[in-house]
């Protein structure tokens, strides 16, 4: 049995944000279908996305079982009408993905400023602790619960009337900063994992300014 009409997948790429993890590949199938397998270094391969014509497979359910493990996926190609067909080595044609360690590599999603509250010359800025798809004891963990102190937030803030930015950092989800009385400020935050070598920073959050809905002012 041959696979003369079948081509191996290529450009296998992990797309992952806050642990939502999808494997993408090429080419768009012509008379062929794909099945994906994923494994940790244990070699216990688990099949997903059986005989699909998609060129992506959501592997979130597998990687969230242990985000600190390193995973490898492989994409098998089969002729559309004969999924039992094997290649010259007696097994279906397949290609391996790069290795992927979710804890070290998942992109940090764009954070959101949940609220800010001014009390005199202090402003407390709170970053929303986004829920991830990582579970523990049946409940979904937040980004902070997964990363702990490995995750910091950087706050950029500036007077609405000027462009000079100041920064503050926190390893919680709250900032307490000093501001000038009577001035309105704008805020943006960024998630950072300093210990990482790749994907260290998220994109900046949308800018929120004092005098808008999210804020609260108290003398």
């Amino acid at each position: 049995s041959g696979t003369t009409n079948t081509v191996a997948a290529y450009n296998l790429t992990w797309k992952s944000t806050n642990f939502k993890t999808i494997l993408e590949w090429e080419p768009k199938p012509v008379n062929q279908v794909y099945t994906v397998q994923i494994s940790t270094k244990s070699g216990d391969w688990k099949s997903k996305c059986f005989y699909t014509t998609d060129t992506e497979c959501d592997l979130t359910d597998e990687i969230v079982k242990d985000v600190k493990q390193t995973y490898l996926a492989r994409v098998f190609s089969y002729p559309a009408g004969n999924v039992e067909s094997t290649g010259s080595a007696g097994e279906p044609l397949y290609e391996n993905s790069p290795e992927f360690t979710p804890y070290l590599e998942t992109n940090l999603g764009q954070p959101t400023i949940q609220s800010f509250e001014q009390v005199g010359t202090k402003v407390n800025v709170t970053v929303e602790d986004e829920r991830t798809l990582v579970r523990k004891n049946g409940t979904f963990l937040t980004l902070r619960q997964v990363f702990g102190k490995d995750l910091i937030y950087t706050l950029y803030y500036w007077k609405s009337s000027s462009s000079g930015k100041k920064t503050a950092k926190t390893n919680t989800n709250e900032f307490l900063i000093d501001v000038d009385k009577g001035e309105n400020y704008c805020f943006s935050v960024q998630a950072v994992i300093p210990s990482r070598t790749v994907n260290r920073k998220s994109t900046d959050s949308p800018v929120e300014c004092m005098g808008q809905e999210k804020g609260e002012f108290r003398e």
Epitope: S39, K41, S42, G43, D44, W45, Q69, S88, A89, E91
Partner: antibody, heavy 118, light 106 residues
Framework: EVQLLESGGGLVQPGGSLRLSCAAS????????MGWVRQAPGKGLEWVST????????YYADSVKGRFTISRDNSKNTLYLQMNSLRAEDTAVYYC???????????WGKGTTVTVSS | DIQMTQSPSTLSASVGDRVTITCRAS??????LAWYQQKPGKAPKLLIY???SLESGVPSRFSGSGSGTEFTLTISSLQPDDFATYYC????????FGGGTKVEIK
Amino acid sequence: EVQLLESGGGLVQPGGSLRLSCAASGFTFSDYAMGWVRQAPGKGLEWVSTISGSGGLTYYADSVKGRFTISRDNSKNTLYLQMNSLRAEDTAVYYCAKAPYGYYMDVWGKGTTVTVSS
Amino acid sequence: DIQMTQSPSTLSASVGDRVTITCRASQSISSWLAWYQQKPGKAPKLLIYKASSLESGVPSRFSGSGSGTEFTLTISSLQPDDFATYYCQQYKSYITFGGGTKVEIK
């Protein structure tokens, strides 16, 4: 320190059986596939068998299929190779190896010698 | 099965030499290739995996390259400790080793 220590080798007659063991330490045993590789005297390396971390997947070289059985006991951090119907050509040093994904071998034991002779 | 052919089978070289060993696969194995070093009476030692990834603790004078069917292991400046036999291994389809290349003192 990651260590693998093979045992169970020896002299056996053709048609006989032998069980090799490999004691692992220094890593989470069940997190890794493991394998056996052999080397006949003066020859190159030959892959024999691989087993996944759970023990649920096993693979064999054609030369040993049906005669050898790989297994593991994760509670004892030990890998096994049951060798039956041994032949003269099975004479070799048998190495146990840690095998991420069951693909390549990143840690090897020192080896145990199996001699099949009458 | 995928066959792996190494050349040369023996290589004579001197300390300080740049040494290149070739491994050819009978069909494309992408980058799924490892290189090992073995000294007499000792177990093999992993040097390179995924064709070009250097194993932790291996000196940087060792490097691997290639993809598809042709691969090379290069030792940029041969050291006394490097005289040994080197094996390639494919893991695209099950596992097969090359026949080995013995690097000996010229």
